[in-house]
């Protein structure tokens, strides 16, 4: 902590300006009024203070606002934000999207720091849900943001926010996250016509149940193999050969290249070899002709 010393004569700061970069740490502490600093925070960013000097300015603000900074100060923190700890940020009440954007801009190009993660958490909790504008902003700065949330956190995303999600925002999502996001997308896009609907819902289909895939197979959607390979294995298994053929359209030929990978491998094992042969792709591993198929999982559920 900086020792309290009197301000030398004539050095008392009347405004926050470039002259302050020549002040020693103790002079900044003694000669800059915290209230003045708070009202002129927007100027700090334009002045090339050293990290040590920024530490002093932060200390002054901490003394002035022991319960946490007001939003009027937070919005203009600029590079001083990088000096904040998650503990500091937990005291804040950030409600303005402009404030959030300003602080994310400071950290732009870097990995999400603990400070940024805390800031986002505070902001979203304050809003009560992850609305479209917030999601738009967060995914613009951090494309992987959505997939960094737990399924529980994702449940607070309203369906209307799904419009802000881009395919690349879902690249690192696992099935549990897509299970939460898919039904929201299904609700959000339900007023679109068939082909437009498929374009929008495609990235979310890793969370789709079997019946939705069956319904899509009736819509001439021509799903690409990359999307098919991301579907839940257990959602794909009950699909018939005819349904998969309809679902993939001209892309059905791609099954041959993927026959050793899930979910294609597991799906092949569940189909009659006769049915697989109708595709003319040379897929092998189906159930031989004359064999009786017993669905033991279904039997278990019925007993």
């Amino acid at each position: 902590e900086v020792e309290k010393t009197a301000c030398p004569s004539g050095k008392k700061a009347r405004e926050i300006d470039e002259s302050l970069i020549f002040y020693k740490k103790w002079e900044l502490e003694a000669c800059v009024d915290a209230a003045l600093l708070a009202t002129q925070m927007d100027r700090v960013n334009a002045i090339p203070f050293t990290y040590e000097q920024l530490d002093v300015l932060k200390h002054k603000l901490d003394e002035l606002y022991p319960q946490g900074y007001p939003e009027s100060v937070i919005q203009h923190l600029g590079y001083l934000f990088l000096k904040m700890s998650p503990e500091d940020i937990r005291k804040w009440n950030v409600t303005s999207l402009e404030t959030l954007k300003a602080l994310l801009e400071v950290n732009k190009g870097h990995e999400m720091s603990p400070q940024v993660a805390t800031l986002i958490d505070r902001f979203v909790k304050g809003r009560g849900q992850l609305d479209k504008d917030t999601l738009d902003t967060l995914t613009a700065f951090y494309p992987g943001y959505l997939c960094s949330l737990s399924p529980e956190e994702l449940s607070s995303v309203p369906p209307s926010s799904i419009w802000a999600v881009r395919p690349q925002d879902l690249d690192t999502c696992d099935p549990r996250q897509l299970d939460v996001l898919y039904p929201k997308a299904r609700l959000a896009f339900q007023n679109m016509n068939g082909s437009e609907y498929f374009v929008k819902i495609q990235s979310f289909l890793g969370g789709a149940p079997t019946e939705d895939l069956k319904a899509l197979s009736q819509q001439n959607v021509s799903m690409d193999l990359a999307t098919f390979m991301k579907l839940r294995t257990d959602a794909v298994l009950p699909l018939t050969v005819a349904e998969v053929q309809k679902l993939l359209g001209p892309h059905v030929e791609g099954l041959k290249a993927e026959e050793r990978h899930r979910p294609v491998r597991d799906w092949i094992l569940r189909q009659r070899q006769d049915d697989l042969d109708t595709l003319g792709l040379g897929l092998q591993g189906g159930i031989p002709n004359g064999y009786l198929v017993l669905d033991l999982s279904m039997q278990e559920a019925l007993s």
């Epitope: 209307s160 299970d179 609700l187 339900q190 007023n191 149940p209 079997t210 019946e211 959602a235």
Partner: antibody
């Protein structure tokens, strides 16, 4: 064909937890979304929430803090727990299947259980 | 949440006549509306979805119309088995919400 059957105690004391189970027979629980809907005597219907077989849920905000919906795929069952019940929670509780094949999208119900009356009283 | 209001609360119509039931949403639900029929001691039965599409096995005398905030269920020629309570339900957004019901009784 697929059938739904609700089961659970018909009487629950105030402040306790109401627990119901819905058994899905004649089909796999994995293919659809499954909901709970309730109807107080002589009144309208209220959606409680849904569950997917993976455990993903969405609940009505008016009940969310008191509701837990869970699933047991090995038994082809899903369950409802409603905590801190009062007389206002007295209702017929239905389990229902969110529609599947007839539309790619749509959160309405094409299959319902017969319902079970739960009375909250001391 | 979207509030669904049905009118009238009770409608008295003679067998063979036409019945018209109304449902109004507090905000637009596009065409994301379903109609159900419920008889005493029974679960609801899906009649109409998408505001106007009949569910499987529903007789042609049942028809739905409307979009946005105003919807109508029409039963063209009432049969004795049609006297029941009818509910509308929006699925444009969560939470899913139902109207309070219209009781259709024999005049």
């Amino acid at each position: 064909q697929v059938q739904l059957q609700e089961s659970g105690p018909g009487l629950v004391k105030p402040s306790e937890t109401l627990s119901l189970t819905c058994t899905v027979s004649g089909g796999s629980i994995q293919n659809y979304y499954w909901s709970w809907v309730r109807q107080p005597p002589g009144k309208g219907l209220e959606w409680i929430g849904y569950i997917f077989y993976s455990g993903s849920t969405q609940s009505n905000p008016s009940l969310k803090s008191r509701v837990i919906i869970s699933v047991d795929t090995s038994k082809n069952q899903f369950s409802l727990k409603l905590s801190s019940v009062t007389a206002a929670d007295t209702a017929v509780y239905y389990c229902a299947r969110e529609v599947g094949r007839i539309a790619v999208a749509g959160w309405f119900f094409d299959l319902w259980g017969r319902g079970t009356l739960v009375t909250v009283s001391s | 949440e979207i509030v669904m209001t049905q009118s009238p609360a009770t409608l008295s119509v003679s067998p063979g006549e036409r019945a018209t039931l109304s449902c109004r949403a507090s905000q637009s639900v596009n065409s994301n509306l379903a109609w159900y029929q419920q008889k005493p001691g029974q679960a609801p039965r899906l009649l109409i979805y998408g505001a106007s599409t009949r569910a499987t096995g529903i007789p042609a005398r049942f028809s739905g119309s409307g979009s946005g905030t105003e919807f109508t269920l029409t039963i063209s020629s009432l049969q004795s088995e049609d006297f029941a309570v009818y509910y509308c339900q929006q699925y444009n957004n969560w939470p899913l919400t139902f109207g309070q019901g219209t009781r259709l009784e024999i005049k």
